[in-house]
């Protein structure tokens, strides 16, 4: 058993049929010694008396809010949550496995630049009685500070018969050094509580590996005289790190016909312009990637040829 | 050339070679070994790699003030990785194919380090750890980790040389 926060405790249980469970001793937070009784949740049934209460926690029915009273007065509460371990593996019932980039990916994180700011998100099908708490640091043995906001519901989607809820959180490294080569990864820890079930999820990454620039901006076409060719130009996204002579991007320009089956013409360039042939009903798209480190490409910015 | 006296390196040449290094480092990894990377665990060999840290002057402002600190750090890193790529981690079994990009990567590391420090000039080189031969079964995982680490190192070096070529070239 360990304390998650004041008056909230997590009991770690090996979860299998007829498991013995954990013996837990609760102590009433009071100077009083006599006449103390204990109840669980809304029940008025007295579970025991005295300053301490010993219980055997085996299942969710044994978890909940234990309250000690004297007379009609509430003295203190202890909320017990359960953390299940099945076959040596902690349960992951609350969050959905996003399976990208690999199986057992529950948290996904992205950064738009090297400033030390990043966003993480996760998915669940649970709509109520759900709370999240997020902590983060750079490194684990001698952690350096990363400040995370509160997790918020950022999207709702319908998937088949059930709804899926996306939560996200923004974090900022306290003393970011954008130009340095990271040697210690960022650690992100999410505590998830659904009713009386506790679970924790972690992710470890370097900012460089989660970079995904915003799409290029101000994408424009300029027809070239007496030619089917056009000059495409664009600019670095506003959110990208500066100076651009240091934090350089590379770009992919694609000409795509109306039909998905049509052959795509692609050009790669480090410049912010390119000359391509504009076919009728086609569109021109440009996306960006860090020039020197192969992290994610941005989403496409597109304009029609016509 | 970045000689200890403090004259300027051939920024444009260094930019071109460092960008090539980035490409090679990504094409060399993931190396197709003979098996999956099943053997996990941190290996000492990759814990000692030199990193370009915050105080090394490799940020745009630091380069403007005095690029020598940063160039010396990059030089140390290039020599370190060049030694690693020549060690039995890469020369031993499972053998790399003759056309593996690791050979080119190795040569390019040497080439850039020589551009930064021509014959006859000597910067203090960081102590290269005496690489005790790796157990053969550790080599695939070590290659994987070293190349991942090298990708990050050469990315910062390439940014430095790109910025230098754009803003510090005579």
């Amino acid at each position: 058993i360990w304390e998650l926060k004041k008056d909230v405790y997590v009991v770690e249980l090996d979860w299998y049929p007829d498991a013995p469970g954990e013996m837990v001793v609760l102590t009433c937070d009071t100077p009083e010694e006599d006449g103390i009784t204990w109840t669980l949740d809304q029940s008025s049934e007295v579970l025991g008396s005295g300053k301490t209460l010993t219980i055997q926690v085996k299942e969710f029915g044994d978890a909940g809010q234990y309250t000690c009273h004297k007379g009609g007065e509430v003295l203190s509460h202890s909320l017990l949550l359960l953390h299940k371990k099945e076959d040596g593996i902690w349960s992951t019932d609350i969050l959905k496995d996003q399976k990208e980039p690999k199986n057992k990916t529950f948290l996904r994180c992205e950064a738009k630049n090297y400033s030390g700011r990043f966003t993480c998100w996760w998915l669940t099908t649970i709509s109520t009685d759900l709370t999240f708490s997020v902590k983060s640091s750079r490194g684990s043995s001698d952690p350096q500070g990363v400040t995370c906001g509160a997790a918020t519901l950022s999207a709702e989607r319908v998937r088949g018969d059930n709804k899926e809820y996306e939560y996200s959180v923004e974090c900022q490294e306290d003393s970011a050094c954008p130009a340095a080569e990271e040697s210690l990864p960022i650690e992100v820890m999410v505590d998830a509580v659904h009713k009386l079930k506790y679970e924790n999820y972690t992710s470890s990454f370097f900012i460089r590996d989660i970079i995904k620039p915003d799409p290029p901006k101000n994408l424009q076409l300029k027809p070239l005289k007496n030619s089917r060719q056009v000059e495409v130009s664009w600019e670095y996204p506003d959110t990208w790190s500066t100076p651009h002579s240091y934090f350089s991007l590379t770009f992919c320009v694609q000409v795509q016909g109306k039909s998905k089956r049509e052959k795509k013409d692609r050009v790669f360039t480090d410049k912010t312009s390119a000359t391509v042939i504009c076919r009728k009903n086609a569109s021109i798209s440009v996306r960006a990637q860090d020039r020197y480190y192969s992290s994610s490409w941005s989403e496409w910015a597109s304009v029609p040829c016509s | 050339r970045a000689v200890p006296g403090g004259s300027s390196p051939a920024w444009t040449q260094c930019q071109q070679l460092s960008q090539k290094l980035c490409t090679l480092a990504w094409s060399a990894h993931p190396l197709v070994g003979h098996m999956d990377l099943r053997e996990e665990g941190d290996e000492e060999t990759t814990n000692d790699v030199p990193h370009i840290q915050c105080g090394d002057g490799c940020d745009p402002q630091g380069l403007r003030d005095n690029s020598q600190f940063c160039l010396q750090r990059i030089h140390q890193g290039l020599i370190f990785y060049e030694k690693l790529l020549g060690s039995d981690i890469f020369t031993g079994e499972p053998s790399l194919l003759p056309d593996s990009p690791v050979g080119q990567l190795h040569a390019s590391l040497l080439g850039l380090s020589q551009l930064l420090q021509p014959e006859g000039h000597h910067w203090e080189t960081q102590q290269i750890p005496s690489l005790s031969p790796s157990q053969p079964w550790q080599r695939l995982l070590l290659r994987f980790k070293i190349l991942r680490s090298l990708q990050a190192f050469v990315a910062v070096a390439a940014r430095v040389f790109a910025h230098g070529a754009a803003t510090l070239s005579p």
């Epitope: - | 003979h34 098996m35 099943r38 053997e39 030694k83 020549g86 060690s87 039995d88 020369t91 031993g92 079994e93 499972p94 053998s95 790399l96 003759p98 050979g103 690489l131 031969p133 157990q135 053969p136 079964w137």
Partner: antibody
């Protein structure tokens, strides 16, 4: 094509030393290790050690440490093994080979230790 | 050190028969195992690398299997030129060690 060509047979007296060579051709000498293997008459194979021609790094079987010395010369793409304090049980064929998974073997050098 | 044990020591077979040679390591060596064939007066020749990977130029009748500490070399239909001594080798950790060999002879 790849070849490892070893020096000729040697007859040496007990207590003396012998130095044999292994010249590589047909591949980049510094790219792979050179292992040395002993095979006594009618017996199995025993690994002596290897050298990394790129950096002269060596690894020895404890059994041969101190008596076997491995060296190489990049300029001639040649690896060498010196065996000292020879005794009769050192009579054997000694093979050089590149990485195990490449199947580049020398033809062997027969060393006979006899008074 | 890892001890490699081969069995049987000698195998008498007729051409065309299927032959199975066994090699056991004293501890797990994953799939870092090599099989060699050696004929009198010749250097060993690599038949199989990493327990089951074939070598170009080696006839397809030679195949390897196993992982961990138990390994097998199979000759699907033994030919007259296959009679020789076969060695297995630990390529997993130092010192590299070889099995004592299995001699495959004509019945």
């Amino acid at each position: 094509q790849v070849q490892l060509v070893q020096s000729g047979a040697e007859v040496v007296k007990p207590g003396a030393s012998v130095k044999m060579s292994c010249k590589a051709s047909g591949y980049t000498f510094t790219r792979y290790l050179i292992h040395w293997v002993k095979q006594a008459p009618g017996q199995g194979l025993e690994w002596i050690g290897y050298i990394n021609p790129y950096n002269e790094g060596t690894k020895y079987n404890e059994k041969f440490k101190g008596r076997a010395t491995l060296t190489s010369d990049k300029s001639t793409s040649t690896a060498y093994m010196e065996l000292s304090s020879l005794r009769s049980e050192d009579t054997a064929v000694y093979y050089c080979t590149s990485n195990w998974d490449l199947d580049y073997w020398g033809q062997g050098t027969l060393v006979t230790v006899s008074s | 050190e890892i001890v490699m044990t081969q069995s049987p020591a000698t195998l008498s077979v007729s051409p065309g028969e299927r032959v199975t040679l066994s090699c056991r390591a004293s501890q797990s060596i994953s799939d870092y195992l090599y099989w060699y064939q050696q004929k009198p007066g010749q250097a060993p020749r690599l038949l199989i690398k990493f327990a089951s990977q074939s070598i170009s130029g080696i006839p397809a009748r030679f195949s390897g299997s196993g992982s961990g500490s138990e390994f097998t070399l199979t000759i699907s239909s033994v030919q007259s030129e296959d009679f020789a001594v076969f060695f297995c080798q630990n390529g997993h950790s130092f010192p590299f060690t070889f099995g004592g060999g299995t001699k495959v002879e004509i019945k």
